[in-house]
Amino acid sequence: SLGWDIAELQLNHTGPQQDPRLYWQGGPALGRSFLRGPELDKGQLRIRRDGIYMVHIQVTLAICSSTSTSRHHHPTTLAVGICSPASRSISLLRLSFHQGCTIASQRLTPLARGDTLCTNLTGTLLPSRNTDETFFGVQWVRP
Amino acid sequence: SLGWDIAELQLNHTGPQQDPRLYWQGGPALGRSFLRGPELDKGQLRIRRDGIYMVHIQVTLAICSSTSTSRHHHPTTLAVGICSPASRSISLLRLSFHQGCTIASQRLTPLARGDTLCTNLTGTLLPSRNTDETFFGVQWVRP
Amino acid sequence: SLGWDIAELQLNHTGPQQDPRLYWQGGPALGRSFLRGPELDKGQLRIRRDGIYMVHIQVTLAICSSTSTSRHHHPTTLAVGICSPASRSISLLRLSFHQGCTIASQRLTPLARGDTLCTNLTGTLLPSRNTDETFFGVQWVRP
């Protein structure tokens, strides 16, 4: 069938202290998030079809002012990458919250069946779980 | 026919003082904006085909420096949502101009025929009407 | 054939002093960048198929803190436009790095065979060449 794999996820929770990963959830019962092709494995998104994908993300910090992001010596950073299989581990997209409270970006990237994408939020600030402020998605665009 | 509904709009004007909505316009005579499927109803974008859409927006403040956004005024916020029918009213995408003068983001979301999207700019500041600084678009990506 | 033209590029280098253009490169040997349809002409992206395209970009400044971007009187600005043929020259997308170190955006725009896209970075700050921080791409979405 035509590879129209697509997913849009909402934030479920952050990981324990030593785990920078964000944990995602999706499905109509949760609101406007969905998985049609890709799947979730312990809150991480796994690709099921080879191809070029548009990956997009927006993350908003929960309790945030421009001073809260600028005051921190180690800026809060969001990185989206392939975290498994280990042989394909790579950072795909990286942004820092300098004096802002939201990052948003998108990129085209080749992904393969079995690639698991991780979204790592480094720093001490917590992300908002509001579904219009923090979301993560992929869209298959061509083989 | 294959649902390739797509639109890219440019800012026409802001609403009167108590109306936070931005009013959009589109069409080849105006430049590089267009509507192919969706339609405008009093400056608001109405969807004519069910499906999952990629919604994207960029808004730049007209007179802005980092001092004006951080020092001078209460946070200006942009929210994209379904504003009618009332039964489907929801915020899809929300961003604040903390220390910046531009917000830009995108997301995948299911939309239905008849959904009207509103872009609400709260705060006192005026958005730029330059077509390369402020624009709003949707693209049907799958059923 | 179905017009699935698509490209994702990584930064090769900046231009000489009087040339604000960024010079791009792409291909599997370089990492996750690729050109499938569009082509590069001296580091600038040339379109080979008419249609509506989703254009996206992210640029991160190499040595950057919020003070380095806010200190400059003339803010660093990124503009994506058609630079040739001259008869079609236009700015498509423009963003300033006010108190931030990264800009990212996307838009839908009609492009024609032979259009060459330029990405002009004005100001004195240098862009990062990290492939997860700075990238530029286009995706054909419909005729």
Epitope: T67 | A62, I63, T67, S68, R71, R129, N130 | -
Partner: antibody
């Protein structure tokens, strides 16, 4: 340093026309907020009109709408106020006010130019 | 349309503190407008003093002494200009202005007299 200097005031008959000018210096004129504010003799300040960023927006007080036109010449860094169908109530000192990085404030003021409308 | 009301006059002694009020009509919330303050001395053009929205969102005009500060009183739907350590040169007319989306409106002004 933001500086603005008004000119063009004078004595006019009711129904007449007049064009005020405001020469600006010390800031990027085209991306700024420029306004006219007037003060009738012995009265308070009244906002008249504003023009924003590359002439993208123009706004007018109800009392002058359709009679006054605000405009700029970015090449000359000059703001104008074309006043038509003048009334005695328009008699005032007209101030030019500017803000280079925030539209909501009148940061820099000129000395004003006197407009008198009388028969 | 916003309407701003200021007391026409106020007098106080040198060294004292005064509070000038700028009340917005009930149809509009002070939180929806940017309130700024201007000083005008006899025979001179107005001078920008300050803008205030909150403690973290305010702006002092160039060369304006820190004796001048802003505040808001949400319950009274009013902007406030506070002047401490009043000095004879503070005698002037004080105007507030409210801004939203292109349009400005001024209050009627308060004439501040410094006694003695």
């Amino acid at each position: 340093q933001l500086q603005v200097v008004e000119s063009g005031g004078g004595l006019m008959q009711p129904g007449g026309s007049l064009r005020l000018s405001c020469a600006a210096s010390g800031f990027t004129f085209s991306g700024s907020a420029m306004s006219w504010v007037r003060q009738a003799p012995g009265k308070g300040l009244e906002w008249v009109s504003s023009i924003y960023s590359h002439s993208m927006y123009t706004y007018y007080a109800d009392s002058v709408k359709s009679r006054f036109t605000i405009s700029t010449d970015n090449a000359k860094n000059t703001l104008y106020l074309q006043m038509n169908s003048l009334k005695p109530d328009d008699t005032a000192v007209y101030y030019c006010a500017a803000s280079s990085d925030y539209e909501g404030l009148f940061v820099s003021w000129g000395q004003g130019t006197q407009v008198t409308v009388s028969s | 349309q916003a309407v701003l009301t200021q007391p026409p006059s106020l007098s106080a002694s040198p060294g004292s503190s005064v509070r000038l009020t700028c009340t917005l009509n009930s149809a509009n919330s002070v939180g929806s407008y940017d309130i700024s303050w201007y000083q005008q001395k006899a025979g001179s053009p107005p001078r920008y003093l300050l803008y205030y929205y909150s403690d973290s969102l305010s702006h002092q005009g160039s060369g304006v002494p820190s004796r001048f500060s802003g505040s808001t009183d949400a319950s009274a739907n009013a902007g406030l200009l506070l002047i401490s350590g009043l000095q004879p040169e503070d005698e002037a007319d004080y105007y507030c202005s409210a801004y939203n989306r292109g349009s400005h409106v001024f209050g009627g002004g308060t004439k501040l007299t410094v006694l003695g």
